[in-house]
Interface confidence: medium
């Protein structure tokens, strides 16, 4: 088992909003849960965009999930990752 490296970034979207993206890379096996949570509760599928789980060329995999949120509420959102029985939570950077 190779645990993922998780990285969260933010970028400007429409006025007052930002897009937050959570990337998981270099993990094996390929089964992974990656989702955005608001106040600890997972967002619905239709408010998130997922990338495919793709091989990254090193025998491991990568994927991403993104959502658009209000800039002033960024602290309420976290990226939740679960892989091979381990999980972690990652905040939106300031």
């Amino acid at each position: 088992t190779v645990p993922p490296m998780v990285n969260v970034t933010r970028s400007e979207a429409s006025e007052g909003n930002i897009t937050v993206t959570c990337r998981a890379s270099s993990f094996y096996p390929r089964n992974i849960i990656l989702t955005w949570r608001q106040d600890g509760v997972s967002l619905s599928h239709d408010t998130q965009q997922w990338g495919d789980v793709l091989p990254d060329g090193n025998g491991t995999y990568q994927t991403w999930v993104a959502t658009r949120i209000c800039r002033g509420e960024a602290q309420r959102f976290t990226c939740y990752m679960e892989h091979s029985g381990n999980h972690s939570t990652h905040p939106v950077p300031s």
């Epitope: 608001q38 509760v41 997972s42 967002l43 619905s44 408010t47 939570t89 905040p91």
Partner: antibody
């Protein structure tokens, strides 16, 4: 389920600050969201704020943003709430409570501390 | 803020009776993820509140099956099929769908 043990009663003067603690045991502290709530005698409850112990991230009820500050100490599995510029309106019982998003997929205040009575009096 | 209104304020019951408690929210409390985070708590004198029902109708662990929750949108109900002495106290509804999360004013269930 685990335990949540809150600090003892406080008698403080108007204008002062108080720091309440909520020491936890029996569960993985860093996996949890912990909220603080206020209850004045004979009244209903008000949610103050939550803190995610794993990152220290917080979200506040706007009513309390200038009044409350939440922190955690992961080494002792303890959550803290500092309440500042106290007035008699802040006299209340304050509870810490643990969310249960994993076991039940969305229960807010599943496990509670016993409460801390704060009395603000000159 | 979402205002949660509970009725009645006081509910006198006889042991063994069915009790029905109402909670109405000032706006729809469906979360953006599609769930309705409506909960019921019981607080006995001198104690911390205890969670009874989460997500409208789900009993929390250890809660007897005489407690049931129902409702949708803005109208919710907690029913106690046969009231026992240990059920007496103040019941609060709570919404966790919109920040700030808010409680109702409470319904006191007491002996008639």
């Amino acid at each position: 389920q685990g335990q949540m043990q809150q600090s003892g009663a406080e008698l403080v003067k108007p204008g002062a600050s108080v720091k309440l603690s909520c020491k936890t045991s029996g569960f993985t502290f860093s996996d949890n969201y912990i909220s603080w709530l206020k209850q004045k005698p004979g009244q209903s409850l008000e949610w103050i704020a939550w803190i995610y112990a794993g990152t220290g991230g917080t979200s506040y009820n706007q009513k309390f943003t200038a009044k409350a500050q939440l922190t955690v100490d992961t080494s002792s599995s303890t959550a803290y709430m500092q309440f500042s510029s106290l007035t008699t309106e802040d006299s209340a019982i304050y509870y810490c409570a643990r969310h249960d998003y994993y076991g039940t997929s969305g229960a807010w205040f599943a496990y509670w501390g016993q409460g801390t009575l704060v009395t603000v009096s000159a | 803020d979402v205002l949660m209104t509970q009725t009645p304020l006081s509910l006198p019951v006889s042991l063994g009776d069915q009790a029905s408690l109402s909670c109405r929210s000032s706006q729809n409390i469906v979360h953006i993820n599609g769930n309705t985070y409506l909960e019921w708590y019981l607080q006995k004198p001198g104690q911390s509140p205890k969670l009874l029902i989460y997500k409208v109708s789900n009993r929390f662990s250890g809660v007897p099956d005489r407690f049931s929750g129902s409702g949708s949108g803005t109208d919710f109900t907690l029913k106690i099929s046969r009231v026992e002495a240990e059920d007496l106290g103040v019941y609060y509804c709570f919404q966790g769908s919109h920040v700030p999360w808010t409680f109702g004013g409470g319904t006191k269930v007491e002996i008639k």
